[in-house]
Amino acid sequence: MATKAVCVLKGDGPVQGIINFEQKESNGPVKVWGSIKGLTEGLHGFHVHEFGDNTAGCTSAGPHFNPLSRKHGGPKDEERHVGDLGNVTADKDGVADVSIEDSVISLSGDHCIIGRTLVVHEKADDLGKGGNEESTKTGNAGSRLACGVIGIAQ
């Protein structure tokens, strides 16, 4: 079982970053940390998408990773996609320092995110509370600014 993973985020614009993942026990929480720069100030949706395919850019990554066929939600919600990691918050300099602990994603098993795509979005994720159908799918987070395939790290 992999205990560490890493993702290099890149896009067509200025957004780029490096995100690290660590899971000390197979059923334990995953620490997610790193930094993303080039963002506009404020909140940006942050999700693991289903496919590790970036052949046509971030669009090829498909929808949120959702092996349990649930509706979109926030990281604290029972009803959420496995890939729903919520939002990152960028400061006035466009930098989002990321530090999350999540107990739904994993680096092994059915909820394994390795080989899938991490995406940072144009707008805030409304955590499924937006009141429209798109909210229950994507959180109305808008376009995909940058992405990268999550790979095993040493």
Epitope: P29, K31, W33, G34, S35, E41, G42, L43, G74, K76, G86, N87, V88, T89, D91, K92, D97, S99, I100, E101, A124, D126, L127, K129
Partner: antibody
Framework: QVQVVQSGAEVKKPGSSVKVSCKAS????????ISWVRQAPGQGLEWMGR????????KYAQKFQGRVTIIADKSTSTAYMELSSLRSEDTAVYYC???????????WGQGTTVTVSS | DIQMTQSPSSVSASVGDRVTITCRAS??????LAWYQHKPGKAPKLLIY???SLQSGVPSRFSGSGSGTDFTLTISSLQPEDFATYYC?????????FGQGTKVEIK
């Protein structure tokens, strides 16, 4: 169950510095930001800044920039807030809190009273 | 910085009353607002996050609503332990900013 315990009350002279500690237990200290918030007598809550221990990166409110330093020691699960060039207006209760960004500050220390008096 | 303005600054109410506190942001913050309860000599306590989500362990008589610039905290039936000062906080942009507080006092 995450708990946060702060250091004891301090009495300081104007112009000096104070360093307040905030020790976390019962959870993963490094995975979350730690914010510092103060309340002066008869005043409201005021955010001073925060640190993400796993990254070591700190952000500060403009008002305190250059006078406050927030650091974290992952080995002891402790965050520190140092405020320099103290003046009487810095007399306040200083709180540290686990900061989950848009999810709010959900775990708070008991507060540390800092009195600045000549 | 985003300014947060609460009203009223204080309210006198009796046990069983419905109490409403409002908070206005100087610019749109979507639903990124938290509410706290603060009692003298105690640490603040998170009640509501994301404008309307109840923090775990908080009684259901507390509710939050609003988006954009105007937000409300409602206590449906005031209990003796609810007499305290309440603060809103925006979580949309750094620096985090709080309202000036609303003191709920016994009538």
């Amino acid at each position: 169950q995450v708990q946060v315990v702060q250091s004891g009350a301090e009495v300081k002279k104007p112009g000096s510095s104070v360093k307040v500690s905030c020790k976390a237990s019962g959870g993963t200290f490094s995975s979350y930001a730690i914010s510092w918030v103060r309340q002066a007598p008869g005043q409201g809550l005021e955010w001073m800044g925060r640190i993400i221990p796993i990254l070591g990166t700190a952000k500060y409110a403009q008002k305190f920039q250059g006078r406050v330093t927030i650091i974290a020691d992952k080995s002891t699960s402790t965050a520190y807030m140092e405020l320099s060039s103290l003046r009487s207006e810095d007399t306040a209760v200083y709180y540290c809190a686990r900061d989950q960004d848009y999810y709010g500050m959900d775990v708070w220390g008991q507060g540390t009273t800092v009195t600045v008096s000549s | 910085d985003i300014q947060m303005t609460q009203s009223p600054s204080s309210v006198s109410a009796s046990v069983g009353d419905r109490v409403t506190i409002t908070c206005r942001a100087s610019q749109g913050i979507s639903s990124w607002l938290a509410w706290y309860q603060h009692k003298p000599g105690k640490a603040p306590k998170l009640l509501i996050y994301a404008a309307s989500s109840l923090q775990s362990g908080v009684p259901s008589r507390f509710s939050g609503s609003g988006s954009g610039t105007d937000f409300t905290l409602t206590i449906s039936s005031l209990q003796p332990e609810d007499f305290a000062t309440y603060y809103c906080q925006q979580t949309n942009n750094f620096p985090w900013t709080f309202g000036q507080g609303t003191k709920v006092e016994i009538k």
